[in-house]
Amino acid sequence: KESCDVQLYIKRQSEHSILAGDPFELECPVKYCANRPHVTWCKLNGTTCVKLEDRQTSWKEEKNISFFILHFEPVLPNDNGSYRCSANFQSNLIESHSTTLYVTDVKSASERPSKDEMASRPWLLYR
């Protein structure tokens, strides 16, 4: 008989570079056998991982794997940092590798032209 644990598939040193102001979905790939486990996201802060209980999350089900998604709508500069997803399974807690978000604040980088500017001066798209 094959073992049937809940599994979390975030690889070592997983990272994403994203822009503040954009929407972003952080995915935790989860594999389970029968009952979908309770999965949560937390953000590393010093030696603790602080649960993100008030954030929008959702599930995306695919054929061989499911994804527990943390939504950033939009990404904020202070979303920069490392996150883990964790699952409770038969009274065991399993925690993923950390995944790091590197947030670029577009205001502090080269000023991004506004939508109005883009419409009136489309060449800005190509500079």
């Epitope: 008989k1 094959e2 073992s3 644990d5 809940v6 599994q7 979390l8 598939y9 975030i10 690889k11 070592r12 040193q13 594999k31 590393l44 030696t47 061989n64 490392s82 399993i94 925690e95 993923s96 590798h97 950390s98």
Partner: antibody, heavy 118, light 106 residues
């Protein structure tokens, strides 16, 4: 129950290549990553590399040019190939399963002893 | 790659003693540290993961602690069957092991 079993040639001539098979039971290779670790006689453990559920691989950077890891999910087998062996590659070679979160190795095979000698 | 410096290399203790082994990582590894026990002629066995979580079936005399770069493994009351080599391992980046601590019982 979960088991891993390594099988290898035992003796390899210097400059030749090494092929070891890890046959697993009690779990599926579509659900767990598998690592390769070696241990020279009387010494410590060295991680060689691993294969993920999707078939992607990670290697020890110092050995990357000499290593390849593959698997056959249907046969529940993982394969280690190492090229250009030298005497300091003499070791016991283990395969070990990743924990469900990928953050430790929870089941190990008994290992297969490999001696590099002419 | 991250270097795990494990001390001491050898420990000679009496049954009933308390034993502490330390591992220092060359850079922060969060709590991505595991401890293994390897008895003579056997393969390694997982004892501790997430730096401080005891693996299934592991006696509670074995404990781990630490975060970042400094980690400790303790056997509160050594028993004769604890004769083994103990290894720490980081799994934050490509896995690396400490050099091992050989525990011998007087």
């Amino acid at each position: 129950q979960v088991q891993l079993k390594e099988s290898g040639p035992g003796l390899v001539a210097p400059s030749q290549s090494l092929s070891i098979t890890c046959t697993v039971s009690g779990f599926s290779l579509t659900g767990y990553g598998v690592n390769w670790v070696r241990q020279p006689p009387g010494k410590g453990l060295e991680w060689l590399g691993m294969i993920w559920i999707d078939g992607s691989t990670d290697y020890n950077s110092a050995l990357k040019s000499r290593l390849s890891i593959n698997k056959d999910n249907s046969k529940s087998q993982v394969f280690l190939k190492m090229n250009s062996l030298q005497t300091d590659d003499t070791a016991r070679y283990y395969c070990a399963r990743d924990r469900p979160d990928g953050r430790a190795m929870d089941y190990w095979g008994q290992g297969t002893s490999v001696t590099v000698s002419s | 790659s991250i270097v795990m410096t494990q001390t001491p290399k050898f420990l000679l203790v009496s049954a009933g003693d308390r034993v502490t082994i330390t591992c220092k990582a060359s850079q922060s590894v969060s709590n991505d540290v595991a401890w293994y026990q390897q008895k003579p002629g056997q393969s390694p066995k997982l004892l501790i993961y997430y730096a401080s979580n005891r693996y299934t079936g592991v006696p509670d005399r074995f404990t781990g602690s630490g975060y970042g770069t400094d980690f400790t493994f303790t056997i509160s009351t050594v028993q004769a069957e604890d004769l083994a080599v103990y290894f720490c391992q980081q799994d934050y980046s490509s896995p690396t092991f400490g050099g091992g601590t050989k525990l011998e019982i007087k």
